[in-house]
């Protein structure tokens, strides 16, 4: 699975929440970032994430001259120079400072149930998705026989009208 271009095909800022409307928030603690899943108080500002979409070609014997087999990969950056990474050994989702080109662990295959309801599959561990476990983000194995609609791996993207990237 290779990224077909070094530049994202599109980027936008959105806030990320769980299927049950809990917010994904990011806090700087002891010089590293922690990720929380929590209920926000009314009027409390949601953290924003920069989603960068990349095209990826799936290795395939299919016809179509390379036209078929395209996937969308996303990277998620809540703050400058930090990206969500899959730690497949620990089954955890972590924020790490990285330089471009980003490591494969920072890329997730995008799935969606509708335009604003999405799931993120680890590029480095197919079948493993970002999910919610004990009020934290974790990597969750989804059995291929299961429907991807399982709620703990579904996230909502809501648009933001602020165009800065904090």
């Amino acid at each position: 699975m290779s990224i077909t271009g070094i530049s994202p095909i599109t980027e936008y800022l959105a806030s990320l929440s769980t299927y049950n409307d809990q917010s994904i928030t990011f806090a700087l603690e002891d010089e590293s970032y922690e990720i929380y899943v929590e209920d926000l108080k009314k009027d409390e500002k949601k953290d924003k994430v920069l989603l960068s979409y990349y095209e990826s070609q799936h290795p395939s014997n299919e016809s179509g001259d390379g036209v078929d087999g395209k996937m969308l990969m996303v990277t998620l950056s809540p703050t400058k120079d930090f990206w969500l990474h899959a730690n497949n050994k620990e089954h955890s989702v972590e924020l790490h400072k990285s330089e471009k080109p980003l490591p494969d662990q920072a890329f997730f295959v995008l799935h969606n149930m509708h335009s604003n309801s999405v799931s993120f599959e680890s590029k480095t561990d197919p079948g493993v998705f970002i999910g919610v476990k004990d009020n934290h983000l974790a990597l969750i194995k989804v059995d291929s026989s299961e429907n991807l609609s399982t709620e703990n791996i579904l996230f909502k993207l809501s648009e933001t009208h602020h165009h800065h990237h904090h």
């Epitope: 599109t10 995008l110 648009e159």
Partner: antibody, heavy 121, light 106 residues
Framework: EVQLVETGGGLVQPGRSLKLSCVAS????????MYWIRQAPGMGLEWVSS????????YYLDSVKGRFTISRNNAENTVYLQMNSLRSEDTATYYC??????????????WGQGTLVTVSS | DIQMTQSPSVLSASVGDRVTLSCKAS??????LDWYQQKVGEAPKLLIY???NLQTGIPSRFSGSGSGTDYTLTISSLQPEDVATYFC????????FGQGTKVEIK
């Protein structure tokens, strides 16, 4: 080469039913969202229905909700549109389309040639 | 529901002209916008996806731009084979087409 072939159109009386089929080839069907889009004679395009790659999620235009049902058979590379209680305003060419990327509902990368449905007494 | 409004409805230009088609969304659609070309008697064809990405095999005279609610399709040098109706389409929230712009040669 990607191919989408729609069948099942024809002349039908108001209130009756029709089932459209779209047979796909040249790509891994089970990885893609599929769609039905229609175009009334001389008019613009109108999205009708969507189904995700595993068939577990379906979406409909408000005016067809409860009357139309989209489904798919991934083993046979086919997507269907069951149209019940047809109305004269459903008269259109119905196009089948495939998504642009695996697993996502973004863009219609390929379209079939369409099948004409005429609802008239 | 998001409404998409295209302008003009009909555009008449000469071969070689730079042509600009406009599409306005009723809400921010985060660049989740495509342009489709439909020639008479044919199925529509994807030209541009995610606002500014050219679909494989489409001539480079076609380009897209925009953000928020305002989007544009530009044909840098109109060719006779570009005579068609062009539809914008949003997929940020649900799926909605604009009503189309018919491009003719003067």
């Amino acid at each position: 080469e990607v191919q989408l072939v729609e069948t099942g159109g024809g002349l039908v009386q108001p209130g009756r039913s029709l089932k459209l089929s779209c047979v796909a080839s040249g790509f891994t069907f089970s990885n893609y969202w599929m769609y039905w889009i229609r175009q009334a004679p001389g008019m613009g395009l109108e999205w009708v229905s969507s189904i995700n790659n595993d068939g577990g999620n379906t979406y409909y235009l408000d005016s067809v909700k409860g009357r139309f049902t989209i489904s798919r058979n991934n083993a046979e590379n086919t997507v269907y549109l069951q149209m019940n209680s047809l109305r004269s305003e459903d008269t259109a060419t119905y196009y089948c389309a495939k998504g642009h990327y695996y697993y996502t509902s973004y863009s219609f990368a390929y379209w079939g040639q369409g099948t004409l449905v005429t609802v008239s007494s | 529901d998001i409404q998409m409004t295209q302008s003009p409805s009909v555009l008449s230009a000469s071969v070689g002209d730079r042509v600009t088609l406009s599409c306005k969304a009723s809400h921010n659609i985060n660049k989740h916008l495509d342009w489709y070309q439909q020639k008479v008697g044919e199925a529509p064809k994807l030209l541009i996806y995610f606002t500014n990405n050219l679909q494989t095999g489409i001539p480079s005279r076609f380009s897209g731009s925009g953000s928020g609610t305002d989007y544009t399709l530009t044909i840098s040098s109109l060719q006779p084979e570009d005579v068609a109706t062009y539809f914008c389409f949003q997929y940020n929230s649900g799926w909605t087409f604009g009503q189309g712009t018919k491009v003719e040669i003067k």
